[in-house]
């Protein structure tokens, strides 16, 4: 049903869903802090623009009685329950921030007439792609897929002279929310990744993964997995690995690799880590000081959601346009705004663009080094280290199929 929005006469409210089920196990207090910090910045920016308006946030908490798993598995209905609560209280703001779980976002989008924008810190799955009023501020699975296909096809770099067309994907069901949907997208038979590969097999058991590492009859030398180095070590340990195995470790929301004193453990030498280019000013900010690297990105997405709303509000007010219109609801895309840590770009479908960074372990220094970067906005690769000190033969990434001749 149509809910009246608290979104006019110089007073603009943001509805923030504080759900028990969340993409990252983050205390809600930290998210509140991030939102409040964002509000302070927005108020300052609006004031500087000569716009004398009030911007506030209303935090809508789930009762937690039914949906209490804490992760995203039981989130499907929680978002709808919160929406019902908002509806009953007639407390809808100009914009909805949250949910972060793919299940709940998909269900909310499906079951409601969204005439207001929804901003999500998460909703990584392919089922949340191409939604007209949904904005996602953490890299969705589609962006990862496009990088991987681009990288697989590359054969014109001095360190990658073979096109790849095969892969194993390790997915055992215990992944974090982001990893679950990233791997789910790679597994899906109808996805772009599957369409572009000639061979792809999902490994679901630890033993399957371990056996592949030295199996002479393996169908691919490349294994994609998602998680941190510790996750890989638990699985791989100190087992011997065939010299032409390449493990691609997707660990987007972890900037520990860029810290000065970090040394790469020996088990990472056959691994390329895919992560995001780190922010700089975040490390010392008040809301992020006590957060782990992953949670920092999650809290930052909430903060940037507030800044995005402020950016759009400023534009519409300066143009004398109404906020409670479909035009406003559909406007949160194809733009760049000033985020907390620099410019944030959203693509035509409201998904955040970013610089992905592919790292390798230098056999000389035992440090993580940048091999290349990839701009998801223009789908372009930028080589960084043209002569990497790889563990692989001739300082080149091997062919994806053992014994196949040069390309």
């Amino acid at each position: 049903s149509q809910v009246s929005q608290n979104c006019h006469n110089g007073s603009y409210e943001i509805s923030v869903l504080m759900m028990g089920n969340s993409a990252f196990a983050e205390p809600l207090k930290n998210l509140e802090d991030a939102v409040n910090e964002g509000l302070e910045i927005v108020r300052g920016r609006l004031q500087n623009a000569g716009l004398n308006v009030t911007v506030n946030a209303t935090f809508m908490y789930s009762d937690g009685l039914i949906h209490n798993s804490g992760d995203c598995r039981s989130s499907t209905c929680e978002g709808l329950d919160l929406l019902r609560k908002i509806s009953n209280a007639q407390r809808m703001g100009c914009v909805l921030i949250g949910p972060s779980c793919t299940y709940s976002t998909f269900q909310m989008y499906l079951d409601t007439e969204l005439s207001y924008p929804m901003i999500s810190a998460g909703s990584f799955g392919l089922s949340c792609d191409y939604k007209e009023t949904l904005t996602r501020l953490m890299s969705p699975a589609r962006k990862l897929m496009y990088f991987l296909v681009n990288f697989w096809k590359t054969n014109d770099l001095p360190f990658k002279t073979y096109s790849w067309s095969t892969s194993y994907v390790y997915k055992n069901g215990t992944e974090t929310e982001d990893c679950f949907w990233y791997l789910n997208a790679l597994e899906a038979s109808v996805s772009y990744f599957s369409h572009e590969l000639g061979f792809k097999v999902v490994l679901r058991q630890d033993k399957e993964f371990q056996d592949i590492l030295m199996d002479h009859n393996r169908k691919s030398n490349v294994i994609i997995m998602c998680g941190g180095p510790e996750f890989l070590y638990k699985l791989k340990g100190d087992r011997a690995v065939a010299e032409d195995i390449v493990i691609i470790l997707v660990d987007l929301f972890n900037d520990q690799y860029f810290e000065d004193n970090v040394t790469a453990p020996d088990y990472m030498k056959n691994v390329l880590v895919l992560t995001l280019s780190p922010g700089n000013s975040l490390l010392n900010s008040s809301f992020s000081r006590n957060l782990s690297p992953t949670k920092r990105d999650f809290a930052l997405a909430y903060l940037n959601g507030i800044l995005l709303f402020g950016h759009m509000l400023k534009i519409f007010l300066e143009n004398g346009e109404n906020i409670t219109t479909p035009k406003f609801a559909h406007a949160f895309r194809n733009l760049t705004f000033e985020g907390y840590d620099g410019p944030v770009t959203l693509d035509d479908w409201g998904d955040v663009d970013s610089t992905m960074v592919l790292l390798y372990t230098s056999v000389d220094t035992k440090k993580y080094k940048v091999l290349l970067t990839y701009d998801t906005h223009v789908n372009k690769t930028y080589p960084v280290d043209m002569s990497p000190t790889f563990t692989w033969k001739n300082s080149k990434l091997p062919n994806d199929i053992t014994g196949r001749g040069p390309q």
Epitope: N155, D156, L157, P158, F159, T161, K369, V370, T373, T381, Y382, P383, V384, D385, M386, S387, S395, P406, Q407
Partner: antibody, heavy 118, light 106 residues
């Protein structure tokens, strides 16, 4: 419009050093690797090394590892190459060239002539 | 390192004629890159990834080849095409250039 403007010609005595600059404009300096290429009279082009301005990663051609030192000043969008212990065989035109993968060396500076003579 | 051998060293032709420049690599490469250089000027990117024309290069130029043998072809020479052309590989590190083919007016 992308432009790479190099410093002027230099005449140096054997044993001296010279620092050649390459100022980039018309694009984001830190987005693209910068290469240095040598062209000695009557010789083929020789690639000397490449630097990534964003991360500071530098790869040298082994042949020039002890001869050239590549640096940059990102605030000035400028790359530098210093040649040390100059000898007559270092007499050449030195070019900087931007890497715009997949089109390697898509823009070149106008070249800096270094003459080593006693 | 990969050695690139260009032939002929000099090609004497008249405007309107077809020019075929060859570049042979000492070992197989995936792609070849070509540059044009005129006297007193810096080289210019001309063809990248074997067959892609760089920005502003006329359609009378084409590139082809695979493995160790690559060709740059000018279908009908124009006066401004007389220059030295260099091939270059970046398949192996370090990148290397050929010795050049000078296309001169007959």
């Amino acid at each position: 419009e992308v432009q790479l403007v190099q410093s002027g010609a230099e005449v140096k005595k054997p044993g001296a050093s010279v620092k050649v600059s390459c100022k980039a404009s018309g694009y984001t300096f830190t987005d693209h690797n910068m290469n240095w290429v040598k062209q000695a009279p009557g010789q083929r082009l020789e690639w000397m090394g490449v630097m990534n301005p964003k991360f500071g990663t530098i790869n040298y051609n082994q042949k020039f590892k002890d001869k050239a030192t590549i640096t940059r000043d990102t605030s000035a969008s400028t790359a530098y190459m210093e040649l040390s212990s100059l000898r007559s065989e270092d007499t050449a035109v030195y070019y900087c060239a931007r890497d715009n993968y997949p089109n390697y060396f898509d823009y070149w500076g106008q070249g800096t002539t270094v003459t080593v003579s006693s | 390192e990969i050695v690139l051998t260009q032939s002929p060293a000099t090609l004497s032709l008249s405007p309107g004629e077809r020019a075929t420049l060859s570049c042979s690599a000492s070992s197989s490469v995936n792609y070849m890159y070509w540059y044009q250089q005129k006297p007193g000027q810096a080289p210019k990117s001309w063809i990248y990834r074997t067959s892609n024309l760089a920005s502003g290069v006329p359609a009378r130029f084409s590139g082809s080849g695979s493995g160790t043998d690559y060709t740059l072809t000018i279908s009908s020479l124009e006066p401004e095409d007389f220059a030295v052309y260099y091939c270059q590989q970046y398949h192996d590190y370090p990148p290397t250039f050929g010795g050049g083919t000078k296309v001169e007016i007959k």
